[in-house]
């Protein structure tokens, strides 16, 4: 009778075990072990017992002890069970961002591991078990479906294997996959709202605002604002589930024409975009051209108003004939025209919007000098010893210099308060002089003495 000890062994993969083969007869012709495993016999006294060290046990095996005794040959098997934890426990890769409301399939793959009867695969969210199944197949695969919720944001999903050898007197061996951190998001189906000027003048700045409500998590939303090829740099303000991105846009002559303004919101692996057209235009103020800004009285003056070729102008409120970018008027300069304003108003329609510009120029008319009865009376009669102010106003542009002299030397104190004396009596020659020439006028002062009263 052949016996083996131990009859059952559970050992780690690659491990070694001592197996004792014994026989019941004292003088066996033969006592040994049959196994493909590397073996080393340990020397023991006696003939009816042999101890073997079996090493590098890689898989389940059934070494067989045999003996040949006078009463016949017999065998006994020992059952070696190899245990090892899986070589690979992995969650199938998934995009880290998942939209709320989507069904997410978690797939765990397990390679290796034994004994399979004691191996379980567990899918978890955090520490919460989602699914538990025995490992079947190579590789073993366990799947579960999760409806993505907002509160799953940042949750860690993992896969764990449990090799439970506690019934065999060993422990519970656990292997866990690298976690998959779920980023959930909500990007509404409505495109972002874009508020911007429809038209923008060259060399000016405009403000563009792009906003969107109903985002989650709003802080992760990326906003891209661009005008044509020009990327704008917005300042983004966040609300609970909304953002508002505000940017300044500067345009130059190179941008002239119709440009595409885009606002793109990217969240997770989705995006929403709004497009708008902005017309960049150049509209210099209209030109008011006077043949000469300063003319002498009686000169013919042409006033021209010129604007952008597509503009419509009015000159002093009078429309161009025909309607268009040019208007003009002719006039003979009079003193009344001195300081007269000529206003050119231009209206340009840009993409349906009306833009207004204006320019005004003043005409200077040189005239005079003038000395007339109204402003410089030819006769004054004043009582002696009375207080009087001689008045004589010369007109002209430039304003003339005025002097009134009696006998070429004695001045009349124009504009000054004087006490009338006999010396003041006489005829004065008033001379008004400017770059435009000179005029003279005789002024007589009569002094009434008290004896004539």
């Amino acid at each position: 009778q052949t016996s083996v000890s131990p009859s059952k062994v559970i050992l780690p993969r690659g491990g070694s075990v001592l197996v004792t083969c014994s026989t019941s007869c004292d003088q066996p012709k033969l006592l040994g072990i049959e196994t493909p495993l590397p073996k080393k016999e340990l020397l023991l006294p006696g003939n009816n017992r042999k101890v073997y060290e079996l090493s590098n046990v890689q898989e389940d095996s059934q070494p067989m002890c045999y003996s040949n005794c006078p009463d016949g040959q017999s065998t006994a098997k020992t059952f070696l069970t190899v245990y090892w934890t899986p070589e690979r426990v992995e969650l199938a890769p998934l995009p880290s961002w998942q939209p709320v409301g989507k069904n997410l399939t978690l797939r765990c793959q397990v390679e290796g591991g034994a004994p399979r009867a004691n191996l379980t695969v567990v899918l978890l969210r955090g520490e919460k078990e989602l699914k538990r199944e025995p490992a079947v197949g190579e590789p073993a695969e366990v799947t579960t479906t999760v409806l993505v919720r907002r509160d799953h944001h940042g949750a860690n999903f993992s896969c764990r294997t449990e090799l439970d050898l506690r019934p065999q007197g060993l422990e519970l061996f656990e292997n866990t996959s690298a976690p998959y951190q779920l980023q959930t998001f909500v990007l509404p189906a409505t495109p972002p709202q874009l508020v911007s000027p429809r038209v923008l003048e060259v060399d000016t700045q405009g403000t563009v605002v792009c906003s969107l409500d109903g985002l989650f998590p709003v802080s992760e939303a990326q906003v891209h604002l661009a005008l044509g090829d020009q990327r704008l740099n917005p300042t983004v303000t966040y609300g609970n589930d909304s953002f508002s991105a505000k940017a300044s846009v500067s345009v130059t002559a190179e941008d002239e024409g119709t440009q595409r303004l885009t606002c793109a919101v990217i969240l997770g692996n989705q995006s929403q975009e709004t497009l708008q057209t902005v017309t960049i235009y150049s509209f210099p103020a209209p030109n008011v051209i006077l043949t000469k800004p300063e003319v002498s009285e009686g000169t013919e003056v042409t006033v021209k108003c010129e604007a952008h070729p597509r503009a419509k102008v009015t000159l002093n409120g009078v429309p161009a004939q025909p309607l268009g970018p040019r208007a003009q008027l002719l006039l003979k300069a009079t003193p009344e025209d001195n300081g007269r304003s000529f206003s050119c108003s231009a209206t340009l329609e840009v993409a349906g919007q009306l833009i207004h510009k204006n320019q005004t120029r003043e005409l200077r008319v040189l005239y005079g000098p003038r000395l007339d009865e109204r402003d410089c009376p030819g006769n004054w009669t004043w009582p002696e010893n009375s207080q009087q102010t001689p008045m004589c106003q010369a007109w002209g542009n430039p304003l003339p210099e005025l002097k009134c002299l009696k006998d070429g030397t004695f001045p009349l104190p124009i504009g000054e308060s004087v006490t009338v004396t006999r010396d003041l009596e006489g005829t004065y020659l008033c001379r008004a002089r400017s770059t435009q020439g000179e005029v003279t006028r005789k002024v007589t002062v009569n002094v009434l003495s008290p004896r004539y009263e």
């Epitope: 419509k312 009015t314 025909p322 309607l323 108003s345 209206t347 919007q353 009306l354």
Partner: antibody, heavy 122, light 110 residues
């Protein structure tokens, strides 16, 4: 100075229809002209405008559904594929004025036609 | 777009009373605003242009005011003939996608 619309009638859905606005006493070369419509019991709805230089602009809802064009004396509004929602009175209006104090032009519907009724029904 | 919001949508007023209609533009339209009166079966009639200028032949009981984004039409000493729908209209832009008219205010005179 006056404007008058014509061409309104009963049409079946999908049948293109062209309305005409005839201007008298002023030149279309100097004015912008707008088309406005009013569905029964509803408010005024601007459809679009044509400029003195033939530029056209449309309300967002009207784009692709209407086309405005003109000759020297008339402005046309084509309803490309009428639906029952297009049942309305269609007005044409002169839409351009000069503000004499500033010398600026602005949009101003100072002259209206009596309107023409379009009924779209199967 | 220059959205025009008109309030109220409708109102009742007694003969001799006062009507106040407000019109708000979503953006600055300066003084480029007109008010229209429309009676059933008739085209709109322009009452006021450039926010406050009375159109010729319009009684002085109609008064327009405001600039920028806030405008008001006031009818003082209302007469039965003033029963109509009133519209504001911006005269600043006719861009693609533009809103030109307010929603209208129906005035019923008792």
């Amino acid at each position: 100075q006056s404007v008058e619309e014509s061409g309104g009638r009963l049409v079946t859905p999908g049948t293109p229809l062209t309305l005409t606005c005839t201007a008298s006493g002023f030149s279309l070369n100097n004015y912008y002209m707008s088309w406005v419509r009013q569905a029964p019991g509803k408010g005024l709805e601007w459809i679009g405008i044509i400029s003195d230089s033939d530029n056209t602009y449309y309300a967002s809802w009207a784009k692709g559904r209407f086309t405005i064009s003109k000759t020297s004396t008339t402005v046309d509004l084509k309803i490309t594929s009428p639906t029952t929602e297009d049942t309305a009175t269609y007005f044409c209006a002169r839409d351009w004025s000069l503000d004499s104090s500033s010398g600026y032009y602005y949009y101003d519907m100072d002259l209206w036609g009596p309107g023409t009724l379009v009924t779209v029904s199967a | 777009a220059y959205d025009m919001t008109q309030t109220p949508a409708s109102m009742e007023v007694a003969v001799g009373g006062t009507v106040t209609i407000k019109c708000q533009a979503s953006q600055n339209i300066h003084s480029w605003l007109a008010w229209f009166q429309q009676k059933p079966g008739q085209p709109p009639k322009r009452l006021i242009y450039k926010a406050s200028t009375l159109a010729s032949g319009v009684p002085s009981r109609f008064k327009g005011s405001g600039s920028g984004t806030q405008f008001t039409l006031t009818i003082s000493g209302v007469q039965s003939d003033d029963a109509a729908t009133y519209y504001c209209q911006q005269g600043y832009s006719r861009s693609d996608g533009e809103h030109v008219f307010g929603g209208g205010t129906e005035v019923v005179v008792k």
